[in-house]
């Protein structure tokens, strides 16, 4: 269930846009980047799609938002909320947040200047 964001500005417009786009490729891209560091010794590729493909799909989805700069933080917060119960230790949480904050730059968007990813009712 989506939390109440209570952000200033036209947050309802952003929330509608974030609801409309498919964030799964972004979630998959970030998880794959995190897992990549753990899989160096493994001979199996546990992913169905390469991370670069997922990154492109992620960027395409984020580009669907009308005002990328204003709504980007909401999208990043939603990704964090969707995945935070998958992350069980301090390093994983921090690494996920770092990868998440790098996402706009990877997509050639301007990163939100202030974006609090400590969301999800304190779960992350």
């Amino acid at each position: 269930m989506r939390r109440e964001r209570g952000r200033q500005g036209d947050s309802s417009s952003c929330e509608r846009q974030v609801d409309r786009v498919n964030l799964k490729p972004c979630e998959q891209h970030i998880m794959q980047r995190i897992m990549g560091e753990q899989e160096q010794y493994d001979s199996y590729d546990i992913r169905s799609t390469r991370s670069s493909d997922q990154q492109q799909r992620c960027c395409d989805e984020l580009n669907e938002m009308e005002n990328t700069q204003r709504c980007m933080c909401e999208a990043l917060q939603q990704i964090m909320e969707n995945q935070c119960d998958r992350l069980q230790d301090r390093q994983m949480v921090q690494q996920f947040k770092r990868e998440l904050m790098n996402l706009p730059q990877q997509c050639n968007f301007r990163a939100p200047q202030r974006c609090d990813l400590d969301v999800s009712g304190g779960r992350c």
């Epitope: 970030i30 794959q32 997922q54």
Partner: antibody, heavy 117, light 111 residues
Framework: VQLVESGGGVVQPGGSLRLSCAAS????????MHWVRQAPGKGLEWVAF????????YYVDSVKGRFTVSRDNSKSTLYLQMNSLRAEDTAVYYC???????????WGRGTLVTVSS | DIVMTQSPLSLPVTPGEPASISCRSS???????????LDWYLQKPGQSPQLLIY???NRASGVPDRFSGSGSGTDFTLNITRVEAEDVGVYYC????????FGQGTKVDIK
Amino acid sequence: VQLVESGGGVVQPGGSLRLSCAASGFTFRDYGMHWVRQAPGKGLEWVAFIRYDERNKYYVDSVKGRFTVSRDNSKSTLYLQMNSLRAEDTAVYYCVKDSGLRYFNLWGRGTLVTVSS
Amino acid sequence: DIVMTQSPLSLPVTPGEPASISCRSSQSLLHSNGYNYLDWYLQKPGQSPQLLIYFGSNRASGVPDRFSGSGSGTDFTLNITRVEAEDVGVYYCMQALQSWTFGQGTKVDIK
């Protein structure tokens, strides 16, 4: 890198017991921890989980309201307080480290809890 | 709650021969992040369990390459290409999608 459980023993039905797990060789405060048990001759059963910062604690339904998981990060120790013990709680209790991604990558040797009159 | 069902429950094997164990979940273990939250553990006689496979098909550090995991959604398989004497024990699958639940275990021993 190891986990060493202690505190097991024989207790009567309705009694209490507190298990401890001493962690070493890794930064205990950064990891989620679990308790998993195994009744004699039976399979594995996950019992409880505590997040690295204690924000979340989860339990299997059969122990909810009776068992409490806690941790002391300054002592690198995990605990399981077991109250209102029943015969079906008889098992070897394993202390287990979470990988950070929900799989278990380090197990202790276990401590035996016997609930019997 | 997610229920995990393994088969067979007992598997007599011949050293050098392949072996496989099936694990089925009552609901899909595929998360939106693209990973199957299904792990395999081996408990050798008199020992604590040890991790073999995580996320359905990712072999844990130090695990011999004769072990492999496959499957997605609700159906998973653990394969051993050539069983060795040291592989005897009880194999468990475990779901980690919602809380954590183990299968009943499959006892593997030498014929």
